[in-house]
């Protein structure tokens, strides 16, 4: 009898270790998406950035989906969202048409069920980039903790997309699940 | 028999509580390192910052190692990495060599097994710090989610290190483990 | 006997699932507070911002308390703290008193037991907001990993509060618990 109980206990321990490990991993979706510069739109108006890498270099995704330029939530939860956006201009890349620039990022959430789009976070700066200087650079970082539901979509909008720095260490956004919804 | 089983159950519960608590803590390395201003290099070129506090004021470290100016990963996992770098200049510190500055931070990862160094995140701004103003200040913040392997090293490079703000609330970097690698 | 043991095992599994789920949720306090612009102080000096939303729009709080303009820790632990502060000015809002601005944020921790206040994180920039431009904008983001004890209070101080952007996506701060204290 006692031996049988110990066997059961071992089963409990074993299955629990598996369950705990498995559920922990499955409960923690994440994504880190880096800019795909082969398809950056021109213009100076606010545009949605739709081309991102999800599986090369630093880019990665797990238990979330990247589709049509949007990061799709597959699992309800509270997530920490972040974005780092770098803008740069070198005089060899053409003459700036204006010195007064609004360099901005907007992290937006779209709900498919109730078609609506809302800005979760924004950041940026107005800049005076004079033609007297051969190189200009500016980075924005935003981050925050948000409740996301399965099916909701996260996307990035920027002004002046043609000034984006195309490096994977410069222009990226991401998310990781921190906890369940009560 | 029934009493014996209950005792076994209590053991299961007890050991599980210990195991869960212990494994949870051990699975979560972290570090928050603050600038050690007694040894900041001069110059305006990009340099690696090697002097950081890990055990005074806000600085702390657990299940990671700080050695030779680098934060060493002891445990495979996905980590959130961050850095906050502040630059400042007061006219009492003397005239700036140039009014056009590139104030930058680079968070780099070095793999010892395959000797190589890569930039994970960068941020900053070109600035025009005119002599007309007696005080100048600028801060950069970067953050992102990265897969780190045991033995890999995180370091911080900045331009214009002589302009760094030496306060612990100003210039720091850190990491915390979010989840295991599948 | 064997049937009885299986019932006990089911109980162990069941109670463990409840316990694990419950303790996980309870172990993870969080807050995301957005600016309440109905009561922003004027002036250009450093002031503590006391009016924040905790339960509308993106604002939310769990297992932490918001009281008297401060975010109060209810549970010991290591927390990731963050703040995003946006400043803006449009010429239609009147002329700026000075073109040289110091736009800063300070995230402070106050301990009630040992009455003291310390800055955990700071960020910002000196800016030249010329009258030649009709619109100016600037955002600051800071974040870091800190040990917080029950009863300690987090608050936000800024310079030039009258220039704050009152949008919930622009000016906010927050915290989420990452792990227990050993």
């Amino acid at each position: 009898g006692s031996q049988h109980i110990r066997a059961e206990k071992a089963m409990v321990d074993g299955s629990w270790l598996d369950l705990a490990k498995r559920s922990k991993l499955e409960a923690q979706p994440f994504a880190h998406l880096t800019i795909n510069a082969t398809d950056i739109p021109s213009g100076s108006h606010k545009v949605s950035l739709s081309s991102w890498y999800h599986d090369r270099g630093w880019a990665k995704i797990s238990n979330m989906t990247f589709s049509n330029g949007k990061l799709i939530v597959n699992q309800d939860g509270f997530y920490y969202l972040y974005a780092n956006i770098c803008f740069r201009h070198h005089e060899t890349s053409g003459d700036l048409a204006t010195e007064y620039l609004q360099l901005m990022v907007y992290v937006t959430k779209t709900s498919i069920k109730i078609p609506s789009s809302h800005t979760l976070m924004k950041g940026g700066s107005t800049k005076y980039w004079s033609g007297n200087s051969e190189f200009h650079f500016y980075s924005i970082n935003v981050g925050g903790f948000f409740k996301l539901r399965s099916g909701e979509e996260i996307s990035i909008e920027v002004s002046n997309p043609s000034l984006l720095d195309p490096d994977q260490d410069a222009t990226y956004f991401g998310a990781f699940k921190v906890r369940d919804i009560d | 028999g029934s009493q014996h089983i209950r005792a076994e159950k209590a053991m299961v519960d007890g050991s599980w509580l210990d195991l869960a608590k212990r494994s949870k803590l051990e699975a979560q390395p972290f570090a928050h390192l603050t600038i050690n201003a007694t040894d900041i290099p001069s110059g305006s070129h990009k340099v690696s910052l090697s002097s950081w506090y890990h055990d005074r004021g806000w600085a702390k470290i657990s299940n990671m190692t700080f050695s030779n100016g680098k934060l060493i990963v002891n445990q495979d996992g996905f980590y959130y990495l961050y850095a906050n770098i502040c630059f400042r200049h007061h006219e009492t510190s003397g005239d700036l060599a140039t009014e056009y500055l590139q104030l930058m931070v680079y968070v780099t990862k070095t793999s010892i097994k395959i000797p190589s160094s890569h930039t994970l995140m960068k941020g900053g701004s070109t600035k025009y710090w005119s002599g007309n103003s007696e005080f100048h200040f600028y801060s950069i913040n970067v953050g992102g989610f990265f897969k780190l392997r045991s033995g890999e090293e995180i370091s911080i490079e900045v331009s214009n290190p002589s302009l760094l703000d030496p306060d612990q609330d100003a210039t720091y970097f850190g990491a915390f483990k979010v989840r295991d690698i599948d | 006997g064997s049937q009885h043991i299986r019932a006990e095992k089911a109980m162990v599994d069941g109670s463990w699932l409840d316990l694990a789920k419950r303790s996980k949720l309870e172990a993870q306090p969080f807050a995301h507070l957005t600016i309440n612009a109905t009561d922003i102080p004027s002036g250009s000096h450093k002031v503590s911002l006391s009016s924040w939303y905790h339960d509308r729009g993106w604002a939310k709080i769990s297992n932490m308390t918001f009281s008297n303009g401060k975010l109060i820790v209810n549970q010991d632990g290591f927390y990731y703290l963050y703040a995003n502060i946006c400043f803006r000015h449009h010429e239609t809002s009147g002329d700026l008193a000075t073109e040289y601005l110091q736009l800063m944020v300070y995230v402070t921790k106050t301990s009630i037991k040992i009455p003291s206040s310390h800055t955990l994180m700071k960020g910002g920039s000196t800016k030249y907001w010329s009258g030649n431009s009709e619109f100016h904008f600037y955002s600051i983001n800071v974040g870091g990993f800190f040990k917080l004890r029950s009863g300690e209070e987090i608050s936000i101080e800024v310079s030039n509060p009258s220039l704050l952007d009152p949008d919930q996506d622009a000016t906010y701060f927050g915290a989420f618990k990452v792990r227990d204290i050993d």
């Epitope: 021109s42 890349s93 053409g94 003459d95 204006t98 043609s162 | - | 030649n132």
Partner: antibody, heavy 122, light 108 residues
Framework: EVQLLESGGGLVQPGGSLRLSCAAS????????MSWVRQAPGKGLEWVSG????????YYADSVKGRFTISRDNSKNTLYLQMNSLRAEDTAVYYC???????????????WGQGTLVTVSS | EIVLTQSPGTLSLSPGERATLSCRAS???????LAWYQQKPGQAPRLLIY???SRATGIPDRFSGSGSGTDFTLTISRLEPEDFAVFYC?????????FGQGTKVEIK
């Protein structure tokens, strides 16, 4: 309708100076970058100089840098090109042209003025 | 600077025929930042295409642009009598902005 009308061209000796003007109408002049483009007789087009809407930044082709100065008076809706130390190879029809202002860098030219002929000869 | 080479130098065609003009860059043109102009004798150039393939306002749809990187093409699907002129390409992805030497489309 957008209109650009150049004036100030003529015959000048090598080493001499000339100031071209371009009167603009039909659009908010101060909001748009402007450029000068030239065309030597029987040859192709060459961009000469550009200026931002505010006039705060100016750009020049290497062939004219240090000799030509572009400027604008937004209160008069007029673009200028001051040409000093003129050379025979500067002989061309000079067109003023509006930038579309839709991109962050100076881009294409639309529309163009009818041009003014500058002849540098002794 | 980016050098643009247009070919052929001269294209002799009849009205109703298709014209294909080439513009090759010495290095990749960033962001497809290329424009095409038409210039008739004694007149100022007129914008036809920008962004490599976007037609300017009022330009007939028989004019079309294509290409990216270093190779760009202007196509006139059916030549009309008023289309005979000199055509120039221009890049604006790099400083300084540069033009091709031109392709003359003449009546055969």
């Amino acid at each position: 309708e957008v209109q650009l009308l150049e004036s100030g061209g003529g015959l000048v000796q090598p080493g001499g100076s000339l100031r071209l003007s371009c009167a603009a109408s039909g659009f908010t002049f101060s909001a748009y970058p402007m450029s000068w483009v030239r065309q030597a007789p029987g040859k192709g087009l060459e961009w000469v100089s550009g200026i931002t809407g505010s006039g705060g930044s100016t750009y020049y082709a290497d062939s004219v840098k240090g000799r030509f100065t572009i400027s604008r008076d937004n209160s008069k809706n007029t673009l200028y090109l001051q040409m000093n130390s003129l050379r025979a190879e500067d002989t061309a029809v000079y067109y003023c042209a509006k930038d579309p202002g839709t991109t962050v860098i100076m881009s294409w030219f639309d529309p163009w003025g009818q041009g003014t002929l500058v002849t540098v000869s002794s | 600077e980016i050098v643009l080479t247009q070919s052929p130098g001269t294209l002799s065609l009849s009205p109703g025929e298709r014209a294909t003009l080439s513009c090759r860059a010495s290095q990749s043109v960033r962001g497809r930042y290329l424009a095409w102009y038409q210039q008739k004798p004694g007149q100022a150039p007129r914008l036809l295409i920008y962004g490599a393939s976007s037609r300017a306002t009022g330009i007939p749809d028989r004019f079309s642009g294509s290409g990216s990187g270093t190779d760009f093409t202007l196509t006139i699907s059916r030549l009309e009598p008023e289309d005979f002129a000199v055509f120039y390409c221009q890049q604006y992805g790099s400083s300084p902005r540069t033009f091709g030497q031109g392709t003359k489309v003449e009546i055969k």
